[in-house]
């Protein structure tokens, strides 16, 4: 808390400008009107305030808006956003994607902080679902964002948003998350032709059931080993040697290098040795 003291004569701030960097903390508290600060928030970022001075400015805004800042102020917070706590952010009602982008920009290059996580949560909950534009924005700043969501949160992603997902956005997703995303992707890409469909669906196949893999094996898709290794164990086990051979095409030779790893190891174990021998790879069931 900054002690309440009268503003010295001639020091009352008429606008937010660089002269304020020479003000002591108590002078900022006494001489800067909170309403003026709120209307000129866009200027704060251009001024090299110290962390201590920013604390004073935040305190003034907190007093002016005890129920939470309006979006007009939030959009121009800039580096002052880094001073906010998750508790502060929970009071906000952020509806504009531009506001979200502006605040994410401040944190760019850093890992997702608790503040950013709270901001995103507030924003997405306010929208009711993860629409395509939001997903585009979030994955641009945080490629791992999608995989940081719980299966329950992912269920609010509409199939139309799946078009915004890039393969690298799914790199850290676990099976439970892909179980939720795969049916949405299947729906989103259902009108595409065979080869184009496979290109789009490929990164979601970690959630595919056996019957879909069997269907793909009939389409000469030549799945690469990296994709095959991400398939669900329970989806892979029922596939026959012939089906896996068709699914992988020329990549089937890669099974040898992965024979000690899941799910290839589990699949090999459950095949008849005679069938495995037809591959000519020396796999031992």
């Amino acid at each position: 808390e900054v002690e309440k003291t009268a503003c010295p004569s001639g020091k009352k701030a008429r606008e937010i400008d660089e002269s304020l960097i020479f003000y002591k903390k108590w002078e900022l508290e006494a001489c800067v009107d909170a309403a003026l600060l709120a209307t000129q928030m866009d200027r704060v970022n251009a001024i090299p305030f110290t962390y201590e001075q920013l604390d004073v400015l935040k305190h003034k805004l907190d007093e002016l808006y005890p129920q939470g800042y309006p979006e007009s102020v939030i959009q121009h917070l800039g580096y002052l956003f880094l001073k906010m706590s998750p508790e502060d952010i929970r009071k906000w009602n952020v509806t504009s994607l531009e506001t979200l982008k502006a605040l994410l920009e401040v944190n760019k290059g850093h890992e997702m902080s608790p503040q950013v996580a709270t901001l995103i949560d507030r924003f997405v909950k306010g929208r009711g679902q993860l629409d395509k534009d939001t997903l585009d924005t979030l994955t641009a700043f945080y490629p791992g964002y999608l995989c940081s969501l719980s299966p329950e949160e992912l269920s609010s992603v509409p199939p139309s948003s799946i078009w915004a997902v890039r393969p690298q956005d799914l790199d850290t997703c676990d099976p439970r998350q892909l179980d939720v995303l795969y049916p949405k992707a299947r729906l989103a890409f259902q009108n595409m032709n065979g080869s184009e469909y496979f290109v789009k669906i490929q990164s979601f196949l970690g959630g595919a059931p056996t019957e879909d893999l069997k269907a793909l094996s009939q389409q000469n898709v030549s799945m690469d080993l990296a994709t095959f290794m991400k398939l669900r164990t329970d989806a892979v086990l029922p596939l026959t040697v012939a089906e896996v051979q068709k699914l992988l095409g020329p990549h089937v030779e890669g099974l040898k290098a992965e024979e000690r790893h899941r799910p290839v190891r589990d699949w090999i174990l459950r095949q008849r040795q005679d069938d495995l021998d037809t591959l000519g790879l020396g796999l031992q069931g």
């Epitope: 676990d174 099976p175 439970r176 991400k230 164990t233 899941r262 174990l269 069931g285």
Partner: antibody, heavy 119, light 107 residues
């Protein structure tokens, strides 16, 4: 529900062969999704996986023990067994048999049997 | 072999505390990592499989996360029955390996 029970001698002399059997009840050793493992734990130490067997007879052993280990399965008796040759005092441990479900992990364990290697 | 390094090796905590145990694999284990709880004189019990899936019958205060080489077991609010030793285990590579264990003791 599936239960596992280890049996075998609690004392083995150095250089001899340790032999243990695990009896599966309430389920079949021929289960499609299951492999059957042996895991041991020396007194006051952590867990060490020894190896597994599938009902087809296919095995997979810990490389550090492979030269001394044999795991076998008897589907007619619903049992699987461990043989560990040329034992030393370092093989003194609680030996567990466990079921591994391919979709989860070691979800069912026996209660463990203490085997001491001493002359 | 894939080595699993658990930390800390022991910790003291109070009932109600949030407890986090980490496990680092020497090479990628994808998401094929399981967590077990063991009490003295008892066999281990499976808590979490495939890095983040809760085993049937296990209280929801237990959760797991991670993929690749870094994995975490979290107990959101420690209960008296949770004082035990916890082990991670990888099953991605055919040579299964366990972490060294983390003993959770009463503060």
């Amino acid at each position: 529900q599936v239960q596992l029970q280890e049996s075998g001698p609690g004392l083995v002399k150095p250089s001899e062969t340790l032999s243990l059997t695990c009896t599966v009840s309430g389920g079949s050793v021929s289960s499609y999704y299951s492999t059957w493992s042996w895991i041991r734990q020396p007194p006051g130490k952590g867990l060490e996986w020894i190896g597994y067997i599938y009902y087809s007879g296919s095995t997979n052993y810990n490389p550090s023990l492979k030269s001394r280990v044999t795991i076998s399965v008897d589907t007619s008796k619903n049992q699987f067994s461990l043989k560990l040759s040329s034992v030393t005092a370092a093989d003194t441990a609680v030996y567990y048999c466990a079921r591994e479900d391919a979709l989860t992990g070691f979800d069912i364990w026996g209660q463990g049997t203490m085997v001491t290697v001493s002359s | 072999d894939i080595q699993m390094t658990q930390s800390p090796s022991s910790l003291s905590a109070s009932v109600g505390d949030r407890v986090t145990i980490t496990c680092r694999a020497s090479q990628s284990s994808r998401y094929y990592v399981n967590w077990y709880q063991q009490k003295p004189g008892k066999a281990p019990k499976l808590l979490i499989y495939a890095a983040s899936s809760l085993q049937s019958g296990v209280p929801s205060r237990f959760s797991g996360s991670g993929s690749g080489t870094d994995f975490t077991l979290t107990i959101s609010s420690l209960q008296p029955e949770d004082f035990a030793t916890y082990y991670c285990q990888q099953s991605y590579d055919a040579s299964y390996t366990f972490g060294g264990g983390t003993k959770v003791e009463i503060k």
